[in-house]
């Protein structure tokens, strides 16, 4: 029977700069029941606080709700593991909420084949930003990426859409069924997961010729 091994805070993520969650990996438990606590203070503060919510983010997590989240402050946090034989502490982690944003995937992905008489046919893709993100405030710039592939293909074709919420793709294989997905990322932060796939059947008469 031993004191617990050193835990590690390995990830902090925020969906929208308004709340965030951090997760830690326990070290070895020393063969004994081990209790974990996350303590933090904000840069410039002397008072330490303990995690306000160990439940929302699942096991080995700390969730900071709206009232505990400030964009303009760096959080300095540490996890303490304690059993009957002693304690061990993680390294301190410095967290700036601005840089840990990972949005939810974009919503309302719509895909349509457009075949104008006077121009080349194209695939028209449209989506909406994730609900939790308020783009009106100007705090966020979201960038988008689209990926698509024929249903049975192994490789994805990736297109960067910038800040647009719609995109046209010209070169497609007629008669194929395509999967289309979109994801987003803030200017500082992480790519969201890909949105659920939308399927589109490309007509056999879809021509790529001029």
């Amino acid at each position: 029977q031993l004191p617990p091994g050193k835990p590690e805070i390995f990830k902090c993520r925020s969906p929208n700069k308004e709340t965030f969650t951090c997760w830690w990996r326990p070290g070895t438990d020393g063969g004994l029941p081990t209790n974990y606590s996350l303590t933090y203070h904000r840069e410039g503060e002397t008072l330490m606080h303990e995690c306000p919510d160990y439940i929302t983010g699942g096991p080995n997590s700390c969730h900071f709700g709206k009232q505990y989240t400030s964009m303009w402050r760096t959080y300095i946090m540490m996890v303490n593991a304690t059993n009957q034989m002693g304690s061990s502490f993680s390294d301190e982690l410095y967290v700036d909420v601005t840089y840990i944003v990972q949005p939810d995937p974009p919503l309302e992905l719509a895909v349509e084949v457009k075949q104008p008489e006077d121009r080349k046919p194209y695939l028209w893709i449209k989506w909406s930003p994730p609900t939790l993100i308020d783009l009106k405030t100007g705090w966020f710039t979201l960038l988008y990426e689209i990926r698509l592939k024929p249903e049975k293909a192994a490789e994805w074709e990736i297109h960067f859409a910038g800040q647009q919420t719609e995109f046209k793709i010209l070169s497609l294989h007629p008669g194929q069924k395509y999967l289309v997905q979109v994801r987003c990322k803030p200017d500082h932060g992480y790519w969201s997961a890909w949105s659920p796939a939308t399927f589109i059947q490309i007509p056999s008469d879809f021509t790529m010729n001029d």
Epitope: S37, T39, L47, E50, Y54, Q67, N80
Partner: antibody, heavy 118, light 107 residues
Framework: EVQLVESGGGLVKPGGSLRLSCAAS????????MNWVRQAPGKGLEWVSS????????HYADSVKGRFTISRDNAKNSLYLQMNSLRDEDTAVYYC???????????WGQGTLVIVSS | DIQLTQSPSFLSASVGDRVTITCWAS??????LAWYQQKPGKAPKLLIY???TLQSGVPSRFSGSGSGTEFTLTISSLQPEDFATYFC?????????FGGGTKVEIK
């Protein structure tokens, strides 16, 4: 509606012990640090002790250190203050208060009176 | 320990008056200061936190300002229900401390 209800106060002789309780309802008790604050008759407020969400951070005023012990039971939504070696100067109304770490002591109980007298 | 000094200790005022209470900290506490109102036989009630943020449900005639070592609580137009004792509290470092209080009485 948030409610904090203290109990356990009463008359005790110097050197005696008392255990105060604070029952919380209408809040996610486990998400907040909790505090005891006291007020001697006709006097101001004095912070006594605080305890964090999972009891990993505990602090006491110098005047009670070594004599009082704060604890909590999140499963029972309850806060406690074990008071030993009581002195005349511990006579006061004892309040429990919720500490919203983003703000201050935003909810208080109605208080329980502790009288230490021979 | 950080000492908080409130001034004045007593204040006589009339309904409609503008009232200002000052709280000085013995060392800098940034904006980690709260103001409470207490009526006889009742628990304190939070009015202002982080020096200037009005607690939900508190009338807008109450306002707070200051940072560092000097803070003020202002009641823009005193109402009958505002006659009470007011305390400041620092939440910058342990031990958490309160000011001595300011009793606002009817003139």
């Amino acid at each position: 509606e948030v409610q904090l209800v203290e109990s356990g106060g009463g008359l005790v002789k110097p050197g005696g012990s008392l255990r105060l309780s604070c029952a919380a309802s209408g809040i996610t008790f486990s998400s907040y640090s909790m505090n005891w604050v006291r007020q001697a008759p006709g006097k101001g407020l004095e912070w006594v002790s605080s305890i964090s969400t999972r009891s990993s951070l505990i602090h006491y005023a110098d005047s009670v250190k070594g004599r009082f012990t704060i604890s909590r039971d999140n499963a029972k939504n309850s806060l406690y203050l074990q008071m030993n070696s009581l002195r005349d100067e511990d006579t006061a109304v004892y309040y429990c208060a919720r500490w919203d770490a983003a703000a201050a002591f935003d909810y208080w109980g109605q208080g329980t009176l502790v009288i230490v007298s021979s | 320990d950080i000492q908080l000094t409130q001034s004045p200790s007593f204040l006589s005022a009339s309904v409609g008056d503008r009232v200002t209470i000052t709280c000085w900290a013995s060392q800098g506490i940034s904006s980690y200061l709260a103001w409470y109102q207490q009526k006889p036989g009742k628990a304190p009630k939070l009015l202002i936190y982080v020096a200037s943020t009005l607690q939900s449900g508190v009338p807008s005639r109450f306002s707070g300002s200051g940072s560092g070592t000097e803070f003020t609580l202002t009641i823009s137009s005193l109402q009958p229900e505002d006659f009470a004792t007011y305390f400041c509290q620092q939440l910058n470092s342990y031990p958490l401390t309160f000011g001595g209080g300011t009793k606002v009485e009817i003139k």
